[in-house]
């Protein structure tokens, strides 16, 4: 059976949304209006992994890109990147562990952590334009609480 | 210091069920990011990778063989289990165990290998 | 799947030469590359991986290169116990795969 995908935008907590900066890197800034066209849809993909009620194994791909969030060591530190695919191959139902995080729903807010570096999470700064990062630390400075806008196909 | 080892039944007969252990120590299948890999060899041939388990229980399987092929873990006994199905003669070989952490996979550590000929 | 392809099979050089042995995929593996060491009585070890990163322990003669396709494994200083086959494995997509090996003798 072929993957069951959705299209959706993220924002985070403080209402940030993610946008692309450059060609391999996301930042998030406060949009409005007409700006608000800026930001990347997400195809989310619900992959092959340890599931329960409210954590959900999700793959997150660009839309109509060929490029997914993954998660790799670099210098020994846990890294969020954007990585390139053959869009023959991709989205599958059993994704690379590196694409893999668990979207987790606590109190209607999303956290995504990386089924590779478990306590490690999808994470934005206070500070406006900068790039979206994979964080070792919850309830800090840095934020890991996003909302989820679903976008019609 | 980081051993695995690799042990199998030597000889079995076509239509049979190869079980494979790897005992290993060193490093615990607990620890986060932790993997292991079985990797096989025909006699003057290649490598070709079967299947791989990760330290929260997530397998991987060639497609090739994957309807034949389980993996398996024992995490407080350092023990990872491949079970190969209906096996025939082009099963036979020398069957490899490795250890990685994440992905994507480097192979850091392999065991010596154990021979397995499936003959008649 | 993901196809590697290492064209030499077998090859000769002299204790010194500097060798170079070429793994090409079937499609681009973005640097997740590693090369393997395979001595004579079975015994395998990582030498490289992420394309150039030197595994510990491994001497400095060993070096890797490569991008996209097309990636490299090159002993500068050829010495007597480099005898062995070396592979190549993409870990960029499932399933892993390696190239087909390349024999390494001495002239």
């Known amino acids: 059976a072929p993957v069951r995908s959705l299209n959706c935008t993220l924002r985070d907590s403080q209402q940030k949304s993610l946008v692309m900066s450059g060609p391999y890197e996301l930042k998030a800034l406060h949009l409005q209006g007409q700006d608000m066209e800026q930001q990347v849809v997400f195809s989310m993909s619900f992959v092959q992994g340890e599931e329960s009620n409210d954590k959900i194994p999700v793959a997150l791909g660009l839309k109509e890109k060929n490029l997914y969030l993954s998660c790799v060591l670099k210098d020994d530190k846990p890294t969020l990147q954007l990585e390139s695919v053959d869009p023959k191959n991709y989205p599958k139902k059993k994704m690379e562990k590196r694409f893999v995080f668990n979207k987790i729903e606590i109190n209607n807010k999303l956290e995504f952590e990386s089924a590779q570096f478990p306590n490690w999470y999808i994470s934005t700064s206070q500070a406006e334009n900068m790039p979206v990062f994979l964080g070792g630390t919850k309830g800090g400075q840095d934020i890991t609480d996003f909302t989820m806008q679903f976008v019609s196909s | 210091q980081v051993t695995l080892k690799e042990s199998g039944p030597g000889i079995l007969k076509p239509s049979q069920t190869l079980s494979l252990t790897c005992s290993f120590s060193?490093?615990?299948?607990?620890?986060?990011?932790?993997?292991v890999g079985w990797i096989r060899q025909p006699s003057g041939k290649g490598l070709e990778w079967l299947a791989h388990?990760?330290?929260?229980?997530?397998?991987s399987y060639n497609p090739s063989l994957k309807t034949r092929l389980t993996i398996s873990k024992n995490t407080s006994r350092n023990q990872v289990f491949l079970k190969i199905t209906t096996v025939d003669t082009v099963d036979t070989a020398t069957y490899f165990c490795?250890?990685?952490?994440?992905?994507?996979?480097?192979?850091?550590?392999w065991g010596q290998g154990t021979l397995v000929t499936v003959s008649s | 799947d993901i196809q590697m392809t290492q064209t030499t099979s077998s090859l000769s050089a002299s204790l010194g030469d500097r060798v170079t042995i070429s793994c090409r995929a079937s499609q681009d593996i973005s640097n997740y590359l590693s090369w393997y060491q395979q001595k004579p009585d079975g015994t395998v070890k990582l030498l490289i991986y992420y394309t150039s990163k030197l595994h510990s322990g491994v001497p400095s003669r060993f070096s890797g290169s490569g991008s996209g396709t097309d990636y490299f494994l090159t002993i500068s200083n050829l010495e007597q116990e480099d005898i062995a086959t070396y592979f190549c494995l993409q870990g960029k997509m499932l399933p892993w795969t390696f190239g087909g090996g390349t024999k390494l003798e001495i002239k």
């Open positions: 060193g490093f615990s299948l607990s620890t986060s990011g932790m993997g």
């Open positions: 388990i990760w330290w929260d229980g997530d397998e």
């Open positions: 490795a250890r990685n952490r994440y992905d994507p996979p480097w192979f850091v550590d």
